[in-house]
Each structure stands twice: as structure tokens, then as C-alpha cells.
Interface confidence: medium
């Protein structure tokens, strides 16, 4: 259903394997980073904290789809992870290694 | 082109009176509003400021479609417009109407 | 060349806290870390914490409050501190450079917990 | 919190290849890098083995890290095994929020 479809945070594992990013990082081997999936139909639900600009491109590909493309269902909040990392050689740790996991998804 | 084809600021010229806000917008009719539009492929561009997230999401699209979507272009900077507007039936005068003009685009 | 030291007591009573000093020479704590690593008698590695070049520390959570690693990064040297000992905190205590992986160990230090 | 399983002990004669087993519990083993680390009698460890199959400088080519995802086990094997190779051997790999997490280790005997 549409409700279903909706702009909504799901999980997304990154195997820091997968994409070649273990050359670098020593720990952890992936993560939880979730993404941002589904529509943003107007009228956009507040929790998805839209801009005026996403309910104007909304309201106007709701009347005429080929004027203006749907607003984008997108991390709007992003939290930090913990990782042991390579810098010259040297294992490194970084208590925050920031805009990794999206904590929040929205409308813009 | 695949780089014409990319994330970047494309006019889009709102009309208050077709979106139904010509109601409570006194002036100016309309004003241009430009819009977000084109892929995000990876490598993401350094002028599109992508996030981290952003370009793992990229990445992992790039190596299976089906385990993430790509990651989207949308307004990374609004400006503010000026409008009369009626206010319990008063003409008012607002400078700075945040958040209705996109001034940048990037990948998110 | 790259040496590690562990200093502190041989003995010390139960309930009591426990100093250790590693004097490090031959590199930098701000660009190497150090791990506490410790080993009752006959018995296997446990890692207790490190204390990151950045300054992060990072603790074992089998240790719970009780543990505190702390520099000086002027004398090069990384402190560890521990309350309230039990005769079961009897061990070798070790200090190690991480690098890439860990390349140098100190020689370690025997602490007998005992009334 | 995984634990990595050692077995206690094991015998070897001099001149033949044995290998050493470190079995995580939970998860998989492939997930995190495992280090082996060689302790003589008495002495401080020194590293064998890290980022699951590099040697660091003058560690014997006699020596080599594996893993087996069907058995869920990290492998060090010792290749033409030599007296001095008699030490205690012990597994380090990471668990989840950047932790050290160390094996029991296994006492290898050289006959």
C-alpha cells in the first residue's frame, strides 16, 4: 500500500569488505548504516520534517508530474560510529567517525 | 550524457496561484523556486558535499543495485524569499521567508 | 630503540588499588596507543584497556568501574589504576605498543594480591 | 559477546606441521581480523600473526593464518615445527564496540 511505501528509515549492513573500505579499516568489519527508502507524496507527513521547498516541488508534481520531479526521501540526521583505522601504518582509533548511520530520514 | 545527466540546480519557476497559495501570498505572483534534479552515481563529485553515508550508499549501489538504491539529489542550501502575505487579514510584510529557494544541490 | 617498562608494586593488600606506571622510550604516545593486557598465573592474555594516540581510552567492561588508564605524554609515560583488588586480581601485568599490530611488549610486572 | 575456543594442549613432533584451531562461538569468524600471538615460558608475547594471514618481520615463513568459514575457526599452522617452536599460542580478534577479545591459548609441545 502506499502508506507502506512510504519515506521511512530500513536497515542497509555495510560489510566494509563488500566495498573494498577493510584495506583501511581494521574494526569494525561492517555496520548497521540503514538508508532513507519510499515515496514523498504530498501532502508530506510532518515527522519527515519537510522544507517549504519539498512541500512546494511536492504540491507542484502533484498537479503536473512533468514540471517538477517528487521531493526525495533522504537521511536527514546522521550519527557517528566507533572504528579502528589505518593512518601511516599507525592502528587509530575514532570514537566518532561521523555522518556513518542515518538516525533520521525526511522529505526534502 | 551521463554528466549532463548529473546532480545539479535546474530552474523551476513557481506560480503561487497554481499550487492555491495565491490565497495568503499577496506578492510577489510567483517566484523561482529551481529544483534538484539528476543521479548521484559513484564517484560523488566533491562539490555535490556528499556525506559518508552518502557515498558508501553510492558504492554499494554501484557493486549491487538491489542491496541499495542510489543515493539522491536534493537541495543542500535554501534561501529565503520576500512575500506579502495576509495575517488574520493583514498585509504583512515577511523579509526572510525561510527555506523556498535552493541555492545548492548535492548527493544525500 | 623501542622499549616498554612497566614499574609498581609487588604486593598488594586486598580491597586496596593498584598503580601501575609504563615508561615508554623510542616512540611517541601521541602517535602509537598502549594496551593493558594482564595474565594470572598458568593462565591466559586478558585484555584490560588502551589508551589511544588521539587520547581515547578504551576499557575491558569485565572491569567495570574499577579501572582508570590514564598519560602523561610529556614523561611518556601511560598509568593504569585499579580499586579494590581481590586475591583473583593476582597477575602479570603487561603493557604493549599497538601499531599496525602489537610489535613490542613490556616484560611485565608480577602484582600478588595477598593479606 | 563471542569467546574464542583453544584447545588446551598439543603434542607435535619435530620436523612435521601442525595446526592450531581458535573456534569463535558466536558470529562469524570471517567477520573480524584474528591475530595469533606466540608466548614462551616466562617471557612476553610477540605477534605471529596479524590481520588473519600477515607475518610481521622475522616471523618464520614456517608459519601461516587461515580460516575456515564451515568450521567457524581461525588456523595457525607451523610448518616443519622446530623445539623452539614449544611456547603457548593464543588468538585475538575484536568483538562489537571495538573490544580485544583473546583465547583461552594452547600449549604446543615439541617431542
Known amino acids: 500500500n502506499a502508506k507502506g511505501n512510504y519515506c521511512k528509515r530500513t536497515p542497509l549492513y555495510i560489510d566494509f569488505k563488500e566495498i573494498g573500505w577493510d584495506s583501511w579499516i581494521i574494526a569494525p568489519p561492517g555496520y548497521e548504516a540503514y538508508e532513507c527508502r519510499g515515496v514523498c507524496n504530498y501532502p508530506l507527513a510532518e515527522h519527515l520534517t519537510p522544507t517549504k521547498h519539498a512541500i512546494i516541488q511536492a504540491l507542484v508534481h502533484l498537479k503536473n508530474s512533468q514540471k517538477a520531479s517528487k521531493a526525495c526521501c533522504v537521511p536527514t540526521k546522521l550519527e557517528p560510529i566507533s572504528i579502528l583505522y589505518l593512518d601511516k601504518g599507525v592502528v587509530t582509533y575514532k570514537f566518532k567517525y561521523e555522518g556513518m548511520a542515518v538516525s533520521e530520514c525526511g522529505c526534502r | 550524457n551521463a554528466k549532463g545527466n548529473y546532480c545539479k540546480r535546474t530552474p523551476l519557476y513557481i506560480d503561487f496561484k497554481e499550487i492555491g497559495w495565491d490565497s495568503w501570498i499577496i506578492a510577489p505572483p510567483g517566484y523561482e523556486a529551481y529544483e534538484c534534479r539528476g543521479v548521484c552515481n559513484y564517484p560523488l563529485a566533491e562539490h555535490l558535499t556528499p556525506t559518508k553515508h552518502a557515498i558508501i550508499q553510492a558504492l554499494v549501489h554501484l557493486k549491487n543495485s538491489q542491496k541499495a538504491s542510489k543515493a539522491c539529489c536534493v537541495p543542500t542550501k535554501l534561501e529565503p524569499i520576500s512575500i506579502l502575505y495576509l495575517d488574520k487579514g493583514v498585509v504583512t510584510y515577511k523579509f526572510k521567508y525561510e527555506g523556498m529557494a535552493v541555492s545548492e544541490c548535492g548527493c544525500r | 630503540q623501542v622499549q616498554l617498562q612497566e614499574s609498581g608494586p609487588d604486593l598488594v593488600q586486598p580491597s586496596q588499588t593498584l598503580d601501575i606506571t609504563c615508561t615508554v622510550s623510542g616512540f611517541s604516545l601521541t602517535t602509537y596507543n598502549v594496551h593493558w593486557v594482564r595474565q594470572p598465573p598458568g593462565k591466559g592474555l586478558e585484555w584490560m584497556g588502551t589508551m589511544w594516540n588521539g587520547g581515547g581510552i578504551d576499557y575491558n567492561s569485565a572491569f567495570k568501574d574499577r579501572l582508570a588508564i590514564s598519560r602523561d605524554t610529556s614523561k611518556n609515560e601511560v598509568f593504569l589504576k585499579m580499586d579494590s583488588l581481590q586475591t583473583d586480581d593476582t597477575a602479570v601485568y603487561f603493557c604493549a605498543r599497538l601499531g599496525y599490530y602489537v610489535d613490542y611488549w613490556g616484560q611485565g610486572i608480577l602484582v600478588t594480591v595477598s593479606s | 559477546q563471542f569467546v574464542l575456543i583453544q584447545s588446551d594442549s598439543m603434542s607435535t613432533s619435530a620436523g612435521s606441521t601442525v595446526k592450531l584451531s581458535c573456534k569463535r562461538s558466536?558470529?562469524?569468524?570471517?567477520?573480524?581480523?584474528v591475530y595469533w600471538y606466540q608466548q614462551h615460558e616466562g617471557r612476553s608475547p610477540t605477534t605471529m600473526i596479524y590481520?588473519?594471514?600477515?607475518?610481521p618481520d622475522g616471523v618464520p615463513d614456517r608459519f601461516s593464518g587461515s580460516i575456515d568459514s564451515s568450521s567457524n575457526s581461525a588456523f595457525l599452522t607451523i610448518n616443519d615445527v622446530q623445539i623452539e617452536d614449544e611456547a603457548v599460542y593464543f588468538c585475538?580478534?575484536?568483538?562489537?564496540?571495538?573490544?580485544?577479545?583473546f583465547g583461552g591459548g594452547t600449549k604446543l609441545t615439541v617431542l
Open positions: 558466536t558470529g562469524n569468524i570471517g567477520s573480524s581480523y
Open positions: 590481520d588473519g594471514d600477515k607475518r
Open positions: 585475538q580478534s575484536f568483538s562489537s564496540g571495538i573490544k580485544f577479545i
